[in-house]
Interface confidence: low
């Protein structure tokens, strides 16, 4: 989905900005896990129907899908169960939160409250520690990409009820030893760090005793630093084309960025004759503008009832905080002239024609073009 | 100050076509799904639609699908109702209705167009 | 679709008395989804009170909504001259949304 925030006015008062679901959670949990996704509603009021979809497909209840109107809970999590996890308002389909899962072998990490391994009452008068869950605890090295959240569990049992405590690198590991501080769950014999930053990599222990002894494991964390990219336009994408007068046309830009990008359709543009600035850069219009919450965004600029105006030189623009990607095409428009057009009414969505052609508004783009509102323009028909 | 205004008072003959509009303003209207809500006289509430002016997606309750068309410039901060051939029935006052954010209820409401259908 | 029923459909009153109205739902509406308007003649309708009983901004405390399932109330705990008006609720969790067709509540 994505938020569409057309800027043909620069310059405008700033509007009061609606709230926008979150970013992208990233999030890790281990194999046979249970994933479990929270998603509140904005202001902590109620919150409309909603339905949870994961890869673009809605989920389906059952015994271990538990799916509920701001919570979803997967039990015995695979490597099928990884992907991108949505909540949406069931009838407008408005993504609300989005998370991206990610399943690994790994003992585990995420932050899951599925309460499973609570101490249990084994029927055993007394007894030292011993792990309820070993088999979860194969997998002693945990690699996660930056900014993720990590758990460990050392789901443990015992008479009387051990107690357990957490080493970083052989010594007592506290909150105040992170930024971002950790979460303890006791009950959940587990140790949570969200957001992982590489400061966080190590050898986490955990510490399993009562008065009859004493267990440990000791877990390794590397934390993969991201190197971000400046987005890619796929090669080949859009591509120039040719268009009969009065027929529609629809370009393609295919964009991938890890980081969230700002896209935008851009027009080439003559004002006063001219198609540079005094300064020598071109002015351009923007048609489009959103902000993509994929990391992968096929995105459409379709022109309806094309004219001669709508020939011309195009942009698709990606922008991310690393840089600007962006491909230039051609759009040319030929055969039997149109009547005279008509002058279209501005109520009429799509097609409002300025009278004069001044420049109302100027704002520098990335130090390479001059950004005009459409108003001072010809405006094109699209949709 | 969300604000959302509609246009004036129509009188039309029946076969013609009419649209009306609703401006908002104070809140990013791309980002608020717009609701038409149908009020004949001396009756209740009935929905007809919703339209989302980022991309113009709409949802069209079944009773009124095919019957009228929503559509939005979100250049201009406008969504439309339109009819393209109007009938007696039509008469009725039309408000439209900004949902709140999480797209459920009526939150900000405008304050109608009465349209009359009259030969 | 969601049939709701309101009930009673006129409701007679004296400011500072207490204001008891229903809305019936033909099946369950889940999760209390569920919303109440007021519309003052000539007026355009006004959120009240969504989620079945989360008052909205602005809203004062004497309006209150309950309920859930099938059957909901909204409670005006006591008449101010200014709530003399027709009341509608709203359910929005299964399309088509649908209103209840009123009930007016006016000065005895």
């Known amino acids: 989905e994505s938020l569409g925030t057309e800027q043909r006015v620069v310059g405008r008062a700033a509007e009061v900005p609606g709230p926008e679901p979150g970013q992208q959670e990233q999030l890790v949990f281990g194999s046979g896990d249970a994933v479990e996704l929270s998603c509140p509603p904005p202001g902590g009021g109620p919150m409309g129907p909603t339905v949870w979809v994961k890869d673009g497909t809605g989920l389906v209840p059952s015994e271990r899908v538990l799916v509920g109107p701001q919570r979803l809970q997967v039990l015995n999590a695979s490597h099928e169960d990884s992907g991108a996890y949505s909540c949406r308002q069931r009838l407008t389909q408005r993504v609300l939160c989005h998370f991206s899962v990610r399943v690994t072998d790994a003992p585990s990490s995420g932050d899951d409250e599925d309460g499973e391994d609570e101490a249990e009452d084994t029927g055993v008068d007394t007894g030292a520690p011993y792990w309820t869950r070993p088999e979860r605890m194969d997998k002693k090295l945990l690699a996660v990409p930056a900014a993720n959240t990590v758990r460990f569990r050392c789901p443990a049992a015992g008479n009387p009820t051990p107690s357990i405590s957490w080493l970083k690198n052989g010594r007592e590991f506290r909150g105040e030893h992170r930024i971002g501080g950790i979460k303890l769950r006791h009950q959940q014999w587990s140790l949570v760090m969200e957001s992982v930053v590489p400061s966080d990599r190590g050898n986490y222990t955990c510490v399993v005793e009562n008065k009859f002894g004493s267990i440990r494991q000791t877990y390794t964390l590397d934390v993969l630093e991201r190197s971000p990219h400046r987005p890619i336009l796929q090669a080949g994408l859009p591509a120039n084309q040719t268009a009969v007068l009065g027929s529609d046309v629809e370009f393609h830009c295919k964009v991938y960025s890890d980081a969230q990008p700002h896209i935008q359709w851009l027009k080439h543009v003559e004002v006063n004759g001219s198609k540079v600035g005094p300064d020598g850069t071109p002015y351009v219009t923007v048609l489009k503008s959103w902000i993509s919450e994929s990391v992968e965004a096929d995105v459409r600029l379709r022109l309806a009832n094309v004219s001669e105006r709508d020939g011309g030189e195009y942009l698709c623009r990606a922008t991310n905080f690393i840089g600007v990607a962006e491909k230039a095409f051609w759009l040319s428009v030929h055969g039997p002239r149109a009547a005279e057009e008509e002058l279209v009414e501005a109520d009429e969505a799509g097609s409002v024609y300025a009278g004069e052609q001044k420049l109302i508004s100027e704002e520098d783009l990335g130090g390479e073009q001059k950004l005009i509102s459409e108003e001072d323009l010809h405006h094109h028909h699209h949709h | 100050e969300v604000q959302l205004v509609q246009s004036g008072a129509e009188v039309k003959k029946p076969g013609e076509s009419l649209k009306i509009s609703c401006k908002g303003s104070?809140?990013?209207?791309?980002?608020?799904?717009i609701a038409w809500v149908r009020q004949m006289p001396g009756k209740g509430l009935e929905w007809m639609g919703i339209?989302?002016?980022?991309?113009?997606?709409?949802r069209y309750s079944p009773s009124f699908q095919g019957q009228v068309t929503m559509s939005a410039d979100k250049s201009i901060r406008i969504a439309y109702l339109q009819w393209s051939s109007l009938k007696a029935s039509d008469t009725a006052m039309y408000y439209c209705a900004r949902l709140d954010y999480s797209g459920s209820w009526f939150d900000y409401w405008g304050q109608g167009t009465l349209v009359t259908v009259s030969s | 679709e969601i049939v709701l029923t309101q009930s009673p459909g006129t409701l007679s009153l004296s400011p500072g008395e207490r204001a008891t109205l229903s809305c019936r739902a033909s099946q369950s509406v889940s999760s209390s989804y569920l919303a109440w308007y007021q519309q003052k003649p000539g007026q355009a309708p006004r959120l009240l009170i969504y989620?079945?009983?989360s008052r909205a901004t602005g809203i004062p405390d004497r309006f209150s909504g309950s309920g859930s399932g099938t059957d909901f109330t909204l409670t005006i705990s006591r008449l101010e001259p200014e709530d003399f008006a027709v009341y509608y609720c709203q359910q929005y969790g299964s399309s088509p949304w649908t209103f209840g067709q009123g009930t007016k509540v006016e000065i005895k």
């Open positions: 339209i989302y002016p980022g991309d113009s997606d709409t």
């Open positions: 989620g079945a009983s």
């Open positions: 104070g809140y990013s209207f791309t980002s608020y799904w």
